[in-house]
């Protein structure tokens, strides 16, 4: 194999290559701005096609935004000696469409990772766990920001995008220590069933601006530390009793439900009753009906059971087209 002046031998990409001499511990790569005092390196909007090879060992905050990285191979940040201080890595808006397994290996202090605004056609199940073991070493990640990572329709693969993201989140149970997960603006139609069960430490979950229609099969029960749940700007029609009870049972949670197309028919009665007595929902007085037409813009908190009726289902012989 080729080898990297700054790589680990277990990482297929950088294990096989790097600079001729080990980097000076405080040198700043070309096209980057470095502050040793702030432990920060910014290589922003420079059309980089690869992660810089010779990053200073002091780097704690690394900004690689607005580039053209396309692919993050295994060991993309592996260096010898390792970037042991790197705690915050921002790769947003860098035209990534492929993140391979082990891309973030050998970053022992990595707490915050932002991959937002990259059209991820391929996100390896082992992107965050680094290994295909059923139980991997715990990831140090505490905050994972994956807003607007959905690829355009013509780049989406046959498998579901939701499933691909979910597989990366649960692989090896590596993200058990994750406190913050942002998944806004990803066109999610559903939340895969077992994802949240594998993320028991979550305090902040942002699912806003997706296309979630229902939470029927989602369990929030074990998210006992959850403080903020953002479900604004989805396609939610109603929350059913099971979901309402689970949310009510979370001791610290605040739920945000604005801008959903609530259907104010007989199925909404339990939710309206719950809204009137719960302190869980922030801005609950802003929630309004979208359907049926006669109920549009009515405030949910002002409804009573008489308002919430369902049209009787006509027998087929009486239905008209």
């Amino acid at each position: 194999t080729s080898s990297a002046s700054s790589s680990s031998s277990s990482a297929p990409f950088l294990a096989s290559a790097a600079s001729a001499q080990p980097p000076l511990p405080d040198q700043c790569p070309a096209l980057c701005e470095c502050s040793e005092a702030a432990r920060t390196v910014k290589c922003v909007n420079r059309n980089l096609t690869e992660v810089p090879t010779d990053l200073p060992l002091y780097v704690r905050n690394l900004f690689l935004t607005g580039n053209q990285l396309a692919v993050l191979p295994a060991g993309a940040f592996a260096r010898r000696p390792p970037l042991a201080e790197l705690a915050a890595l921002n790769l947003s808006g860098s035209r990534l469409d492929e993140v391979r397994g082990g891309a973030f290996e050998h970053l022992p202090s990595l707490r915050q990772l932002d991959l937002s605004h990259n059209p991820l056609a391929y996100l390896s199940p082992f992107a965050f766990s680094g290994s295909n073991a059923s139980i991997s070493a715990p990831s140090p990640l505490v905050e994972l920001i994956l807003n607007h990572i959905v690829p355009p329709d013509d780049k989406r693969q046959n498998r579901s995008f939701e499933g691909m993201v979910a597989a990366a989140l649960v692989a090896g149970r590596a993200l058990q220590g994750l406190h913050l997960l942002e998944l806004a603006s990803n066109h999610f139609l559903y939340l895969p069933r077992d994802v949240l069960a594998q993320l028991p430490s979550l305090r902040y979950l942002d699912l806003s601006n997706n296309s979630l229609v229902s939470l029927t099969y989602v369990s929030f029960r074990n998210l006992t530390h959850l403080e903020s749940l953002h479900l604004e700007d989805n396609a939610l029609k109603v929350l059913h009793n099971g979901t309402l009870a689970e949310l009510q049972g979370l001791p610290h949670v605040r739920v945000f439900l604005d801008n959903n197309p609530w259907v104010c028919d007989c199925h909404m009665a339990d939710m309206v009753t719950w809204l009137k007595q719960t302190g869980v929902v922030q801005g609950k007085d802003r929630l309004t009906c979208a359907f049926p037409e006669k109920m549009r813009n009515r405030v949910l908190l002002e409804l009573n059971s008489a308002d919430l009726d369902c049209d009787p289902i006509l027998p087929p012989s009486l239905q008209t087209s």
Epitope: C32, R46, N47, L48, T49, P73, D97
Partner: antibody
Framework: EVQLVESGGGVVQPGRSLRLSCAAS????????MHWVRQAPGKGLEWVAY????????YYADTVKGRFTISRDNSKNTLYLQMNSLRAEDTAVYYC?????????????WGQGTTVTVSS | DIVLTQTPLSLSVTPGQPASISCRAS??????????LHWYLQKPGQPPQLLIK???NLESGVPDRFSGSGSGTDFTLKISRVEAEDVGVYYC?????????FGQGTKLEIK
């Protein structure tokens, strides 16, 4: 027309040094990554080294790591390969080649090559 | 390192007849978003020239009698009707990871 012209080859004794150059024209040199690829007499192609467009990334084959250094001067549209501690097995035609990126790229333009002979 | 194995190592083809070269990788060089396998022709006394990028995309200026196919580990370069100017050595090359490697080459001769 894209042109890459290598120079600096020659006959050199083992253990000595040589510096190859590659002069680029006909395209915006500073927008492209560059490689060195070599071909030993009668043999196939071997990738040697890569440098990114802005000199932020450098990669080497194991066979040359620690002995060769790739560099570039975008103001002069020139790519370099500093070869130290030369060995007989470094004898080859050395080509410079252009790419748009390392992994997503390919060698879409090649120079004619310069011959390096390491012999005592 | 990824090893690329080309077959055959040489072939002799009558002008106007088709030709096919195989390249097998020791591990997959495809992802769902890109195929990291390219083909080159090195004519006698010349540097290599790019024929096919990303397994199947014809480089500008290359005659359309050349075509490429494949994904994962198995790839094929085809020439629908060989012409005299097609003689030389054909190489496949991957860009999946460092080091980039080439196949050992396939020498095409005209009968």
């Amino acid at each position: 027309e894209v042109q890459l012209v290598e120079s600096g080859g020659g006959v050199v004794q083992p253990g000595r040094s040589l510096r190859l150059s590659c002069a680029a024209s006909g395209f915006t040199f500073s927008n492209f990554g560059m490689h060195w690829v070599r071909q030993a007499p009668g043999k196939g192609l071997e990738w040697v080294a890569y440098i990114s467009s802005g000199s932020t990334s450098f990669y080497y084959a194991d066979t040359v790591k620690g002995r060769f250094t790739i560099s570039r001067d975008n103001s002069k549209n020139t790519l370099y390969l500093q070869m130290n501690s030369l060995r007989a097995e470094d004898t080859a035609v050395y080509y410079c080649a252009r790419t748009n990126s390392l992994l997503r790229g390919f060698f879409d333009a090649w120079g004619q090559g310069t011959t390096v002979t390491v012999s005592s | 390192d990824i090893v690329l194995t080309q077959t055959p190592l040489s072939l002799s083809v009558t002008p106007g007849q088709p030709a096919s070269i195989s390249c097998r990788a020791s591990q997959s060089v495809s992802s769902s978003s890109y195929t990291y396998l390219h083909w080159y022709l090195q004519k006698p006394g010349q540097p290599p020239q790019l024929l096919i990028k990303s397994a199947s995309n014809l480089e500008s200026g290359v005659p359309d009698r050349f075509s490429g196919s494949g994904s994962g580990t198995d790839f094929t370069l085809k020439i629908s009707r060989v012409e005299a100017e097609d003689v030389g050595v054909y190489y496949c090359q991957h860009s999946w990871e460092i080091p980039l490697t080439f196949g050992q080459g396939t020498k095409l001769e005209i009968k």
